[in-house]
């Protein structure tokens, strides 16, 4: 399977909410022994590999934000902890999964990574990630609403193994 990032750049004004999205593509095994671990974290454009470093989002780690379920099942993060930090990650039946960040500030600007790990018989088998940038703007140059920029076709199917 692959992970697609429909948008490579989100530009938002302070105070706005944004939903960053990734999509699971390709054949997804729906066997009973297969589950998917999906999560989000901040990172940087490393010298070696983008998304190799896992940093917290608003002090919540990738473990705090993870979803763990079968192939194309729907799921949401544990509400209390994430919502106290203005965050919610979710996954639908169609392979889309997202993180919503509320009341953005300039400090939320940076590189965000989604990670999908396929787990068979309790062992990590295959992992892929997608990357996108969020820029939060202040002042007179800030847009009135979030503006999204589509990934190039090459970027949108980010298949780099982690």
């Amino acid at each position: 399977f692959k992970v697609a990032t429909p948008y490579s750049l989100y530009v938002c004004p302070e105070g706005q909410n944004v939903t960053l999205t990734c999509r699971l593509l390709g054949p997804v095994d729906k066997g009973h022994d297969v589950t998917f671990y999906k999560t989000w974290y901040r990172s940087s454009r490393g010298e070696v590999q983008t998304c190799s470093e896992r940093r917290p989002i608003r002090n919540l780690t990738f473990q705090d934000l993870h979803l763990h379920h079968g192939g194309h099942q729907a799921a949401n993060t544990s509400h209390d902890l994430a919502q106290r930090h203005g965050l919610e990650s979710a996954s639908d039946h169609h392979g889309n999964f997202s993180i919503t960040m509320r009341n953005l500030t300039l400090l939320d600007s940076g590189l965000y990574c989604c990670l999908v790990v396929e787990i068979r018989h309790h062992h990590s088998e295959h992992r892929v990630h997608g990357a996108m940038e969020l820029q939060v703007q202040t002042g007179k140059d800030a847009p009135s609403n979030c503006v999204v920029y589509p990934s190039s076709s090459q970027d949108s199917e980010n298949i780099t193994a982690a």
């Epitope: 901040r42 454009r45 300039l106 400090l107 940076g110 940038e133 820029q135 140059d141």
Partner: antibody
Framework: QVQLQESGPGLVKPSETLSLTCAVS?????????WNWIRQPPGKGLEWIGY???????NYNPSLESRVTISVDTSKNQFSLKLSSVTAADTAVYYC??????????????WGQGTLVTVSS | DIVMTQTPLSLSVTPGQPASISCRAS??????????LQWYLQKPGQPPQLLIY???NVESGVPDRFSGSGSGTDFTLKISRVEAEDVGVYYC?????????FGQGTKLEIK
């Protein structure tokens, strides 16, 4: 080793435009950092002017915003400051500085040596 | 703008003795549990250099006699044993909201 080096005229006439460049070496400007200008009038404290990211997003101090333009040239690994309609109050040492935004702290971890710009006729 | 106020504005310390500088922000500089407060030292004729970031994290290469503490609006920089090379002006700086702002500076001299 990351180094920043400011360059530009040391003397600017009142009402003209101050132009400075900061050359970045030992590090790619196309990374998750904000590239800042900060100034310090003689014998006084530090004032943040503004920053630019490699992708061209800027943020300026509202007190100077109407006169400031910061630009980036990724091909030359450098960024620049233009401050228009200068007066004697703009006389200061001008520093460029790097600030990571891949975390939440946004600290200035690398500074240039600074260049003194005097506004005088 | 967030106004940063340092006290004292100057202090004279005997080598080997401790020193303490306070910084107060006009509003909280916390963001989801992180204190967005830095300390810098500007030695004579040099640019500022980072000492402490996020209130209490000592920058790599900075001697361990420097420490930072505090949260919300009140912060402190401590030097456990002042050395001659510590002279200069100390600045606090907030990165919670733009414009980024600095304290007015505290000048440290050796007795």
């Amino acid at each position: 080793q990351v180094q920043l080096q400011e360059s530009g005229p040391g003397l600017v006439k009142p009402s003209e435009t101050l132009s400075l460049t900061c050359a970045v070496s030992g590090f790619s400007i196309t990374s998750d950092f904000a590239w800042n200008w900060i100034r310090q009038p003689p014998g006084k404290g530090l004032e943040w002017i503004g920053y630019i990211t490699y992708s061209g997003f800027t943020n300026y101090n509202p007190s100077l915003e109407s006169r400031v333009t910061i630009s980036v040239d990724t091909s030359k690994n450098q960024f620049s400051l233009k401050l228009s309609s200068v007066t004697a109050a703009d006389t200061a040492v001008y520093y460029c500085a790097r600030q990571e935004y891949g975390n939440y702290v946004w600290y200035f971890d690398v500074w240039g040596q600074g260049t003194l710009v005097t506004v005088s006729s | 703008d967030i106004v940063m106020t340092q006290t004292p504005l100057s202090l004279s310390v005997t080598p080997g003795q401790p020193a303490s500088i306070s910084c107060r922000a006009s509003e909280s500089v916390e963001y989801y549990g992180t204190s967005l407060l830095q300390w810098y030292l500007q030695k004579p004729g040099q640019p500022p250099q980072l000492l402490i970031y996020a209130a209490s994290n000592v920058e790599s290469g900075v001697p361990d006699r420097f420490s930072g503490s505090g949260s919300g609006t009140d912060f402190t920089l401590k030097i456990s044993r002042v050395e001659a090379e510590d002279v200069g002006v100390y600045y606090c700086q907030q990165s919670r909201k733009v414009p980024w702002t600095f304290g007015q500076g505290t000048k440290l001299e050796i007795k």
